[in-house]
């Protein structure tokens, strides 16, 4: 069961896995959640009754029964991990801790104007886990305004002490605020010959890359496939680092694959969720339970529902045995990965999906779409919303996209004639406009945020955010779309779709059923040739067929240009402008979302 509240003056007895230092009980709970085995924790707050060397200790605990005996102890704060909870989890921690010095390896010292600048520096430094900043009131003159960037093996401080006039905080990489490049490529037949900080077993290079991403010290990795000549190293995932942050040497070796941590792409691709099944593969580990199951999918469900289960192996039933049910072996290990991986035994293995809630909701696979045709089916574009105005009468105004549980991204030009957010209604999970009746539930709009530089669509900056009055509960029919990663600027998207209820020709009316059209992207150089009287900037992106025929039109404005990349849908464009609709050699012009990711995050993550 999910228990979120913290237990004051309470200590859990026994079950210790490890001790780390955290600046608050709240952060201790996050660390426990992300630890492969931690289910409960006890944090010691600063207190005159406690030995200062025990202040800020966060003891991570495990228990077969999922609970431990409680003992009263002043200054102790205990609680449960969020593993038991179904809600979205994030490691993003923007808190600044006043008068705390978080100890680690001080590898970089520089002058900064403010703690915020120091935190930004940490966020944009590949090695930095946390920082301490000496304020201008710091007693020692030569240390004032000094920003110390720090890292540790665990990503958490080695100790935390009280120190007047300093502030500390964590890197905001996990908040998707880093400007570091997102390098998704996996390099075949390549070994990175740098120092290993850890090694785990993984079924493929993708899982290895994801493990590297959420390992605090891993910057890149090398994976030896099951065809690797040295048997003892098959399926070995080597987690690596280097001083420069880049591999120093690349060696060409067959059957090895290498790649980079996806730390800077975390908000737009799954890094915790290993959802694939591995056929003819057995995962070895500590056995938690053996249960009968109808299929490997059922076995994965059982593992996901068992809070201590990390991975499983399913052995299909021998003909007519046990009512056709196979054996489902629920397993765990100290680090969440199999201790060994064996092939050729007929098992089907996989991982718990419990960790999927640590990934951005937008990375969840949606049900397969019907290709061809122009009318969409229910749940095909679950991020698409219809924005209505109620003044002077209620009508569809524009499209928009869910990008967070309280945020809609749309076009600025949609708000011509909108005097106040009070007249707006956002409807999600809608296929047909005719579904919208008096009593249909909608989201009210709390705030309209227009880009400061917007003047008219043709000049760019045609982007706006709507902050909703209430939060969206994600379901199959309403869920967010991922923003593109800043590190993905060079990705060539080939599977792009424009959707909306807009006109199907220049003189028309709003359509009842959500329409879709697959449209190829056009280079900005090509687009500029088609719009000689306009300036097509890098903040715009164009899409269309040379011969015309398929395009967004009036009423589609603000809606998404959605592109599928690596099995994840990304919001590449916002329908903005174009000469006419679907005209020959007149592509549609869209707001290039990747160029506004910083703006979006600044506005949506403002405290």
């Amino acid at each position: 069961e999910c228990v979120t509240q913290l237990l004051k003056d309470t200590c859990f007895e026994g079950g210790d896995i490890t001790t780390v230092f955290t600046p608050s009980a709240k952060y201790c709970q996050v660390v426990c959640t992300y630890h492969p085995r931690c289910l409960l924790f006890t944090f010691t707050a600063e207190s005159p009754s406690e030995d200062p060397t025990r202040w800020f200790t966060c003891v991570l605990k495990d228990s077969v029964t999922e609970t431990l005996p409680r003992v009263n102890r002043t200054a102790a704060i205990s609680g449960y991990s969020f593993k038991q909870c179904s809600h979205q989890i994030s490691a993003c921690n923007k808190d600044i801790y006043v008068d705390l010095d978080m100890k680690g390896i001080n590898y970089n010292s520089s002058v900064a104007k403010s703690a915020q600048e120091c935190q930004e520096r940490c966020t944009d430094d590949v090695h930095c886990h946390f920082f301490t900043y000496a304020t201008r009131q710091f007693p020692s003159l030569e240390h004032r305004n000094i920003c110390l960037l720090k890292h540790t093996q665990t990503g958490t401080p080695t100790r935390i002490t009280k120190l007047d006039k300093v502030v500390s905080g964590f890197s905001l990489k996990s908040c998707a605020l880093s400007n570091l490049a997102c390098i998704r490529d996996i390099f075949p037949n390549t070994v990175f010959a740098d120092s290993n900080i850890d090694s785990v077993m993984a079924p493929d290079a993708f899982v290895c890359g994801r493990i590297c991403t959420h390992h605090p010290g891993c910057l890149f990795f090398t994976f030896f496939s099951q065809e690797w000549p040295k048997e003892s190293q098959r399926n070995l995932c080597l987690l690596k680092t280097s001083e420069s942050g880049l591999p120093s040497t690349r060696i060409k070796k067959s059957k090895a694959l290498s790649g980079f941590s996806l730390q800077s792409c975390r908000h737009s691709i799954p890094v915790f969720c290993h959802s694939s099944f591995y056929h003819d593969t057995d995962f070895l580990g500590e056995e938690l339970d053996i249960v009968a199951a109808k299929s490997h999918e059922a076995c994965q469900k059982l593992c996901t529902n068992a809070v201590r289960c990390q991975f499983f192996t399913y052995t299909p039933a021998q003909a007519s045995c046990n009512e056709g049910k196979g054996k489902c072996y629920l397993k765990l290990s100290s680090n969440g990965s199999p201790t060994k991986i064996l092939h050729g035994r007929g098992g089907i293995s996989g991982y718990t999906l419990r960790l999927c809630k640590m990934d951005n909701e937008c990375t969840t696979k949606i049900k397969p779409r019907i290709v061809g045709g122009t009318a969409s089916v229910r749940g095909e574009w679950p991020w698409q919303v219809t924005l209505h105005t109620t003044s002077p009468t209620q009508r569809h105004l524009c499209g928009g996209s869910i990008i967070g549980n309280q945020w809609i991204l749309t076009a600025a030009h949609c708000f011509y004639g909108v005097e106040s957010p009070k007249i707006l209604r956002v409807y999600s999970g809608i296929l047909n406009q005719s579904e919208i009746k008096e009593d249909t539930s909608f989201f009210g709009v709390q705030e309209i945020i227009i880009h400061d530089q917007y003047k008219m669509a043709e000049s760019g900056y045609d982007i706006a955010l709507l902050k909703l009055e209430t939060t969206v509960n994600y379901t199959d029919s309403q869920r967010p779309i991922c923003l593109p990663s800043k590190g993905d600027r060079n990705v060539i998207y080939t599977d792009c779709w424009v959707t909306g209820w807009g006109y199907r020709k220049l003189r028309d009316k709003i359509q009842n059923t959500l329409q879709k059209a697959k449209i190829p992207l056009v280079t900005n150089e090509e687009c500029q040739k088609r719009y000689r009287g306009h300036k097509i900037t890098h903040k715009m992106i164009c899409a269309g067929y040379r011969e015309g025929g398929k395009d967004a039109c009036k009423g589609d404005s603000g809606g998404p240009l959605s592109c599928k990349h690596n099995e994840v849908w990304h919001l590449v464009g916002i329908t903005s402008w174009g000469e006419g609709c679907a005209q020959r050699e007149r592509p549609g012009v869209y707001t290039n979302v990747v160029e506004y990711v910083d703006w979006i995050l600044e506005k949506t993550q403002a405290v």
Partner: antibody, heavy 118, light 112 residues
Framework: QVTLKESGPVLVKPTETLTLTCTVS????????VAWIRQPPGKALEWLAE???????SYNSRLKSRLTISKDTSKSQVVLTMTNMDPVDTATYYC????????????WGQGTLVTVSS | DIVMTQTPLSLSVTPGQPASISCRSS???????????LEWYLQKPGQSPQLLIY???NRFSGVPDRFSGSGSGTDFTLKISRVEAEDVGVYYC?????????FGQGTKLEIK
């Protein structure tokens, strides 16, 4: 609530420079653009200039060389200067604010009558 | 610049009767973003102008439904279905599709 109030000289001499101030309340100049519009006695409205949220400016092309629009967001003021005034510039000068975007103009000042005469 | 031409320049109407004002632009006002930035304002005697219609045909909240706007491209019309005494003043069309923005020369409505 939203208010705009124009202020400046009632009388200016020909060739002089007119400086008008629009003081706003109930909203921030970093979130909305403001325009100046004038109306000679018994004649039509004429759009003069706009200052956008980000400080960019747009001008009536016929009068562009004579106009400068600026703002001081902290003081909630928009200033219009018009050089080389002429009796034909005698008019009521209004400042106005749009809704969410630059137009339509929903909020208007009450206007200030400027007479150009020696 | 876009020139806005209104006709007639003045009109005298009996209360309860309809009135119609035409506004023609020198270029199409249909913006490439799908909006048509054409607005109608009424300036009552001794007052600042007030918004009636935006986007060709959208009545601003609080504006009586006897006012309606129509048109597309370069030809636009403001209609008053039944004129009332309080409708007297000067009516202006205004375009914000192309910078610099421009007003029509105004149409004075009087009551017979």
């Amino acid at each position: 609530q939203v208010t705009l109030k124009e202020s400046g000289p009632v009388l200016v001499k020909p060739t002089e420079t007119l400086t008008l101030t629009c003081t706003v309340s109930g909203f921030s100049l970093s979130s909305y653009s403001v325009a100046w519009i004038r109306q000679p006695p018994g004649k039509a409205l004429e759009w003069l200039a706009e200052i956008w949220r980000d400080g960019d400016t747009s001008y009536n092309s016929r009068l562009k060389s004579r106009l400068t629009i600026s703002k001081d967001t902290s003081k909630s003021q928009v200033v219009l200067t018009m050089t080389n005034m002429d009796p034909v510039d005698t008019a009521t000068y209004y400042c106005a604010r749009g809704m969410t975007l630059a137009t339509p103009f929903l909020y208007w000042g009450q206007g200030t009558l400027v007479t150009v005469s020696s | 610049d876009i020139v806005m031409t209104q006709t007639p320049l003045s009109l005298s109407v009996t209360p309860g009767q309809p009135a119609s004002i035409s506004c023609r632009s020198s270029q199409s006002l249909e913006s490439s973003d799908g909006n048509t930035y054409l607005e109608w304002y009424l300036q009552k005697p001794g007052q600042s102008p007030q918004l009636l219609i935006y986007g060709v045909s959208n009545r601003f909240s609080g504006v009586p439904d006897r006012f309606s706007g129509s048109g597309s491209g370069t030809d636009f019309t403001l209609k008053i279905s039944r004129v009332e005494a309080e409708d007297v003043g000067v009516y202006y069309c205004f375009q914000a599709t192309r910078d610099p923005f421009t007003f029509g020369q105004g149409t004075k409505l009087e009551i017979k």
